[in-house]
């Protein structure tokens, strides 16, 4: 056998090159047949009507033919015949790859609530061979479950992903990525997750700056509430007691002027949205004001000079806790 061919793999719509090669040429004629055994070329003669076949090279040692705009119907065995005595025959198989026609991602719900499990589907339509679908949430790969449907040598793959969402997933893309021999580079489609979650509440002391609250001082607390949807109601209450009469509420801010010991207690900021409600507590402890000790006095009879030394001593029974955080989130 001195007639050789090579199998050809080509992407639909592109060009396939079929080559019939003769090792030891003796001027025998070469013929190329299609899968129906119809003559494509006999030497340089092409009886077949299909003008997509064009002669690239013809000699006693090679018949090289191009087939443009390849379609899936062109797939199959192509026969090279060498009319030696006895005649020789070899075949080349053309395999046509079809990239997925369409890539669609479908999320069961446009908006999900934290903790909920949602279904995401991705469909790669009409490819050959079947497409491999990979899932990513941001940069993290997830495992989906794929189903393959075959129709007329083409494959439609649907992959299902069950995803439990968390508040951190809000705005994160869910990516459906396909891997297919006819696709170079990344073919992917994505949808951004929209996750609703109950508020997260944080209390910040905006005054005094050093964080130490003393009798006579003022206190300003700011309540920060973040949620989706953004909380519309932010309220301040005093746990187990009435709010002091001299307390001023202004939106998320709580002002208490001229602090005294009766203001000691727990102040709660509450926030809510359609998902749920949350609160954060601030435990106020009002410290004693600074105390002063009278200085010693010296008196002389002739020349009298009075020196008064004022020594300010700060006494604080909780001095060791000056910088401690006194807010509790719930």
């Amino acid at each position: 056998q001195n007639l050789f061919t090579k199998d050809v793999t080509v992407i639909e719509g592109e060009v396939a090159t079929i080559s019939c090669q003769v090792n030891k040429s003796d001027d025998s004629v070469i013929q190329l047949l299609n899968p129906n055994r119809q003559t494509i070329y006999f030497r340089d003669f092409r009886p077949l009507k299909d003008s997509r076949f064009q002669l690239l090279n013809f000699s006693s040692s090679e018949l090289k033919v191009s087939l443009t705009n390849v379609s899936i119907s062109d797939e199959g065995r192509y026969f090279c015949q060498l009319y030696t005595d006895p005649p020789q025959e070899s075949y080349t198989t053309i395999t046509v790859l079809v990239p997925p026609r369409n890539l669609m991602i479908d999320i069961q719900k446009d908006t999900a609530v934290e903790g909920e499990e949602i279904e995401v589907n991705c469909t790669a339509m009409a490819s050959k061979p079947a497409t491999t679908i990979r899932w990513f949430k941001g940069n993290t790969e997830l495992k989906g479950k794929s189903e393959v449907e075959e129709w007329s040598d083409m494959y439609t793959v649907t992959s299902q992903l069950m995803l439990k969402v968390h508040k951190e997933d809000d705005g994160v893309p869910v990516i459906c990525q396909v891997e297919h021999p006819a696709v170079t580079g990344n073919l992917q489609t994505q949808r951004y997750l929209e996750v609703q979650y109950k508020p997260q509440v944080h209390i910040q002391m905006t005054y005094p700056l050093q964080g130490l609250t003393r009798e006579g001082d003022a206190l300003e607390l700011t309540c920060e509430a973040i949620g989706k949807p953004q909380p519309v109601m932010v309220t301040w209450v005093r746990v187990d007691d009435e709010m002091p009469q001299h307390a001023v509420l202004s939106g998320p801010n709580l002002f208490i002027n001229n602090l005294n010991k009766t203001d000691n207690g727990t102040y709660r900021c509450e926030a809510s949205n359609i998902v749920g409600k949350a609160h954060s507590d601030y435990m106020l402890y009002v410290y004693d004001p600074p105390t002063t000790i009278p200085p010693p006095t010296t008196t002389t009879t002739t020349t009298t000079t009075t020196t008064t030394t004022i020594l300010t001593i700060i006494t604080d029974s909780r001095a060791g806790e000056e910088g401690s955080i006194r807010a509790v989130d719930h």
């Epitope: 006999f42 030497r43 340089d44 003669f45 092409r46 009507k49 009319y83």
Partner: antibody, heavy 116, light 110 residues
Framework: EVQLVESGGGLVQPGGSLRLSCAAS????????MSWVRQAPGKGPEWVAN????????YYVDSVKGRFTISRDNAKNSLYLQMNSLRAEDTAVYYC?????????WGQGTLVTVSS | QSVLTQPPSASGTPGQRVTISCSGS????????VNWYQQLPGTAPKLLIY???QRPSGVPDRFSGSKSGTSASLAISGLQSEDEADYYC???????????FGTGTKVTVL
Amino acid sequence: EVQLVESGGGLVQPGGSLRLSCAASGFTFSSYWMSWVRQAPGKGPEWVANIKQDGSEKYYVDSVKGRFTISRDNAKNSLYLQMNSLRAEDTAVYYCARGGGRHDYWGQGTLVTVSS
Amino acid sequence: QSVLTQPPSASGTPGQRVTISCSGSSSNIGSNTVNWYQQLPGTAPKLLIYSNNQRPSGVPDRFSGSKSGTSASLAISGLQSEDEADYYCGTWDSSLSAGVFGTGTKVTVL
């Protein structure tokens, strides 16, 4: 040496039939497509029909379709043209030629005259 | 009637170059190879050029062929008296699924 010898021509009345033969030698007959080409007096050649090595593919010029049949017998190294319902315009020298599209060898021809 | 068009005649003195054109369409010359035949008076046609520009063994290199698009041409350089003959182009027509010949050109050596 490649040789193609046609026979079977002659005078025939319109509507009549003739069978032309071509005896091939000097090459492997079963390896080649074969053709019939005709040439009316004072005119250029006109391709008539061709046939694949195993006889599985045949092509004809429109003017003879349904009236002429090309065939071959590889065991006898012979090519045939059965001509029925002959017309005056079929009058020509009929050549047997080797090849389907490229006719690299021709016979000397046989004259077919269709006349009443 | 012929599908391929050639000039009816061409002439030249010995040693001159003569060119014959053959015009067709996308379904014949445009998509298939062209052959040229020489027919001396009283004889069968003989293959002169095949596959657009290839010469069979025994054909002098004075004969050359070319093809461009839907036209082909035959050139005879160094014209000789024995070149006086009828010349025909021929190819396959993919639309007709039939062979086609040119109208023929008579070459005269003056």
